[in-house]
Amino acid sequence: GPAKSPYQLVLQHSRLRGRQHGPNVCAVQKVIGTNRKYFTNCKQWYQRKICGKSTVISYECCPGYEKVPGEKGCPAALPLSNLYETLGVVGSTTTQLYTDRTEKLRPEMEGPGSFTIFAPSNEAWASLPAEVLDSLVSNVNIELLNALRYHMVGRRVLTDELKHGMTLTSMYQNSNIQIHHYPNGIVTVNCARLLKADHHATNGVVHLIDKVISTITNNIQQIIEIEDTFETLRAAVAASGLNTMLEGNGQYTLLAPTNEAFEKIPSETLNRILGDPEALRDLLNNHILKSAMCAEAIVAGLSVETLEGTTLEVGCSGDMLTINGKAIISNKDILATNGVIHYIDELLIPDSAKTLFELAAESDVSTAIDLFRQAGLGNHLSGSERLTLLAPLNSVFKDGTPPIDAHTRNLLRNHIIKDQLASKYLYHGQTLETLGGKKLRVFVYRNSLCIENSCIAAHDKRGRYGTLFTMDRVLTPPMGTVMDVLKGDNRFSMLVAAIQSAGLTETLNREGVYTVFAPTNEAFRALPPRERSRLLGDAKELANILKYHIGDEILVSGGIGALVRLKSLQGDKLEVSLKNNVVSVNKEPVAEPDIMATNGVVHVITNVLQPPANRPQERGDELADSALEIFKQASAFSRASQRSVRLAPVYQKLLERMKH
């Protein structure tokens, strides 16, 4: 058959939950401390909460059935009677009472024809303000008759026909009734919730609803123009040209900021947005949802997209509607011919209308922002330059912040890119120019996107002119080639000598993409003497082992994921892993990762890696290449305190410092 509607699916779930109590029993969730009841969907059933409030499960006859004394469940179908009597069956006795008062309506409800009645519950009538009720029953009950006729449709309409966004023609002056049928199974009629649906009568069907509904006369734009509380909004809508849309056809939800909401915004920010047509349009579009959303449809958190493109979390807490977890809706379900309005008393400023400073204020990068401000870079973050700010997380600075000196200023300038970027358009190998004049490289990995050694830790925040990238560490631009990096660090004097001896200097100085696992002097010292002497005594063996320490692409620690098999220049693969924030290569921890170079990255290791296919095989007849004089001279392996005259004094000192 045809696909079941969300309402029918929820009802089916309630039947399943109730069937152990007998036939045609439905499980109903009742919000504790209220009379609000809901047929239950899976999520609510397990959470036992509606709008954050605890519920109790009760078991009732499913719509259209009744109990039989002495029998289990609800085995009997309700006897069919006319509409008037069916109002009593569903418990809408107040509607019956008011129907009697009109005199004309009861004969219709009892007579021939086919009608649908959306009957307000007794509680719905009781909750009407006294003056509204008084006006209905005065004027020889004409208003009451009109009100009741507005709740009626001149044909039978069952829930499977109630489609989201449809309008029904009522029996009062052919006025429209708005129907919304939400994915969670809730059905609303002019934002009143269907409580009990599809109660058949001989001459139609009765649906019990939780409010008295009234005719809708104005569109959204007209409501904005009528209400004094929307004076600022009115001006903003006019300035942005959105009034045409808000008075046209369609179904929208306007989260309408009151004058008070605008007043809460610092005037500098407000004036900037109001004076910027693009920012203003984005601001207003961020208050408009693409479809009508009645408050009754919200029973739990729901992500909705605004016309501007931002996702809002609409939820509820008891009777209060919330947006992004805050109860800022002061008046809900103001119906318009083209949607629904909820008054809000806080402005929802989208990222697209914010400066970099404002974006950063809501992110976990406040420490970095303070540093940019102290370094005199604040004007870049609040101006109209197209920029991307690479802001490290606060946690990066848990051990303190650097002093603001020329070096720090330059470092920070290299965290600002001279273009407004979006991470989804970045590609591997792309270079980005910074305010500091550096070219930064983009590395795209399976599960991360990195700029030099620093990887993006949160979704971009794209502002009016600038984009904020939240980064997982301070970015260190490369200062030279891999060879420059190694030569500039005395921990690698032996490695440098080994590289020179093995003829790999040129490789590590030229353009390229290398990952170098760089053994420290201590790593060489830790080799068993035999392996050390094999390494030093055979240029081919040395080159082979050193090439095994060089990966053929750039792999920064943020790009590792769990495990990466990195091909080395020697041919074998290196197993690089990341666990508990510690990088390991071939299961050996890396002492210091991510020293960036223009042609690669250096990871410091404290052991010499051995290629699996080339682990030393002892052969007594092996003849090695000639001795490697450069390496021998620079090496710390010698424990000698006296040296033959062949060594220059500079090497003598080096050996002395490093000897056993």
Partner: antibody
Framework: QVQLVESGGGLVKPGGSLRLSCAAS????????MYWIRQAPGKGLEWVAT????????YYADSVKGRFTISRDSAKNSLYLQMNSLRAEDTAVYYC?????????????WGQGTTVTVSS | EIVMTQSPATLSVSPGERATMSCRAS????????????LAWYQQKPGQAPRLLIY???TRETGIPARFSGSGSGTEFTLTISSLQSEDFAVYYC?????????FGQGTKLEIK
Amino acid sequence: QVQLVESGGGLVKPGGSLRLSCAASGFTFSDYYMYWIRQAPGKGLEWVATISDGGIYIYYADSVKGRFTISRDSAKNSLYLQMNSLRAEDTAVYYCVRGWDRYDSWFACWGQGTTVTVSS
Amino acid sequence: EIVMTQSPATLSVSPGERATMSCRASQSLLYSSNQKNYLAWYQQKPGQAPRLLIYWASTRETGIPARFSGSGSGTEFTLTISSLQSEDFAVYYCQQYYRYPYTFGQGTKLEIK
């Protein structure tokens, strides 16, 4: 046939000096690591010093560091141990030893030893 | 430094019987990169220089009879002589070449029972 013949041992007073020599034959001397190992009377073996095939890498036991110097002369196929500031505890038989190959290794071939006695 | 400890200090065994002696290192002699144990065994007879028997903990030197075998890994090693001959009675030393300074055990004296 590999042959290592030590010489230069003898009686010396504490603080005195001695130079031990080892004449090597039957193999290409310049292709091997060489070692001095000693054995005090009635005691076990103790490694003293190492020199690499090319004479560049040199290692000493802490007990002799700064007093003894190992050297080699490949032209003469000879290994030397210059011993200065001798002490009574340096009294031992000193063995000249060849490694297994051109790399630092275990002690493959031993000379018959030369006795050094330090006594006043 | 790595300390080598041999046991027993003296071992009395009859000719033709099996002799087993142990050597323990204060730290592992197994180099993970090549899975080799950096340990050698030597034999020394009175008035003679020591002679290499075993290297890499279990590899017999050329010319050493098959009755000599080495085993063990990491820190625990054993030298076994399967059927003692009269010429086997001597002092046996183990030695590590995993780290400088190279060190020997204090020796096990194998005597005729």
